[in-house]
Amino acid sequence: TEVKVIQPEKSVSVAAGDSTVLNCTLTSLLPVGPIRWYRGVGQSRQLIYSFTTEHFPRVTNVSDATKRSNLDFSIRISNVTPEDAGTYYCVKFQRGSPDTEIQSGGGTEVYVLAKPSPPEVSGPADRGIPDQKVNFTCKSHGFSPRNITLKWFKDGQELHPLETTVNPSGKNVSYNISSTVRVVLNSMDVNSKVICEVAHITLDRSPLRGIANLSNFIRVSPTVKVTQQSPTSMNQVNLTCRAERFYPEDLQLIWLENGNVSRNDTPKNLTKNTDGTYNYTSLFLVNSSAHREDVVFTCQVKHDQQPAITRNHTVLGFAHSSDQGSMQTFPDNNATHNWN
């Protein structure tokens, strides 16, 4: 009658940090000899527990192995780490000099469930402009088992990644994932988000999300217009420079008269649009009595360290006009006005 070593579970899954029991029962108390637990097989197998006086941190016997009739040689491994993954064998030896291995259980594979780290989404170092294609990368690490799902979304719409890789490709204690997606920016993207969603067996149907706010990666340049308002009195003319639908807020506005700086605006009260962009209006009051010759007024807008956008507006001096008090306004570079 031969002793049988029964390991009833082919595999067990345990969350990192938790405890797991590896079951092993024998069908016989004979022959006399020790029972030992190993991880792996062959020469490289590692002794995990021996039912003797030796001390094994984190591993304890489930039942009283000193009891004569005991057939239960199950062990409990506490505070499991990803390094504990592997196949464990309960092995019966016959007492001798040396002890000889006579029977092994079928093995129990321990899968250590480790949660993926919160996904981190990174984008380009420099801001992109509408219609530009930009890449975003999502990374998560430290998960086990290897099987994982990663999805990309932009404003609720799923995006298809350029590439997703899980490393290493072979067997390992834990794994990392990296995925890249390409997004075409548009001027309405200031309020948009790109989301990387990671689903894994350890997450109980509550995927982890990494978010990239496109406001950090987009630049929408302003539309600049200069207009002249009807004179408020015979001695002054109102010029308005309007920068519309720009992002981010960083804006400098300079008024020039015939190429010379007349006023430097650092906008404080920007108007925010529903799409997340900003508008800014600058009023420039021109004293008509100081200008008898033609004057070119320039509104120069510097946005987010980009080259300046300039819009010119010419106001004709008093000497050019026979029809006193009449006013002609021309768009952008050709606006004219007669002083009285």
Partner: antibody, heavy 119, light 107 residues
């Protein structure tokens, strides 16, 4: 002093499932070190070990009955039970529950309950 | 399964006689053997555990010996209250098995 008491129907119809419960008093079923067994004795015959549940969890069955037998424990009620399916007249017997002692022998037994399989 | 063969299947002896029952295992079971007494209509009672150890409260006229495959149970001086059937049981191998029993009667 631990005492055991079997309970269950005395008459079971062929092909049905025989269900017996052993109630433990004077001690806890989950206290360490013991096997809790079911044994039966056919009329005028010897003793046959059906199976046992060990305090640490494993359940052992006699291979001759394994396909039909289930032993379970309810620690909250301090009971363990036996279910034997698809019974025939050959399962007519006195059924005992027992507890293994500090040493290896079965030192506490219930008084036994007679189960007859008949239509 | 380990077969446990008990002999004789029955015996008749006088009060005060020495009674010997043997139990043979089909394979080496070391000393993993118990002896029980069962009186008519009652549950078995443990007398000897681990082949030779007397259970607490059991009279010293009962004894056991043996190891490996051959075991002996002895009543040194038969008493009227010893009328019963005696069983050996091995627990070295699953399933645990009992001998067929020896019925002891008074002449």
């Amino acid at each position: 002093q631990v005492q055991l008491q079997e309970s269950g129907p005395g008459l079971v119809k062929p092909s049905q499932t025989l269900s017996l419960t052993c109630t433990v008093s004077g001690g806890s079923i989950s206290s360490g070190g013991y096997y809790w067994s079911w044994i039966r004795q056919h009329p005028g015959k010897g003793l046959e070990w059906i199976g046992a549940i060990y305090y640490s969890g494993p359940i052992y069955y006699n291979p001759s009955l394994k396909s039909r037998v289930t032993i379970s424990v309810d620690t909250s009620k301090n009971q363990f039970s036996l279910k034997l399916s698809s019974v025939t007249a050959a399962d007519t017997a006195v059924y005992y529950c027992s507890k293994e002692g500090y040493h290896s022998g079965m030192d506490v037994w219930g008084q036994g309950t007679t189960v007859t399989v008949s239509s | 399964d380990i077969q446990m063969t008990q002999s004789p299947s029955s015996l008749s002896a006088s009060v005060g006689d020495r009674v010997t029952i043997t139990c043979q295992a089909s394979d080496d079971i070391s000393d993993y053997l118990n002896w029980y007494q069962q009186k008519p209509g009652k549950a078995p009672k443990l007398l000897i555990y681990d082949a030779s150890n007397l259970e607490t409260g059991v009279p010293s006229r009962f004894s056991g010996s043996g190891s490996g495959t051959d075991f002996t149970f002895t009543i040194s001086s038969l008493q009227p209250e010893d009328i019963a059937t005696y069983y050996c049981q091995q627990f070295a191998y699953l399933p645990w098995t009992f001998g067929g029993g020896t019925k002891v009667e008074i002449k």
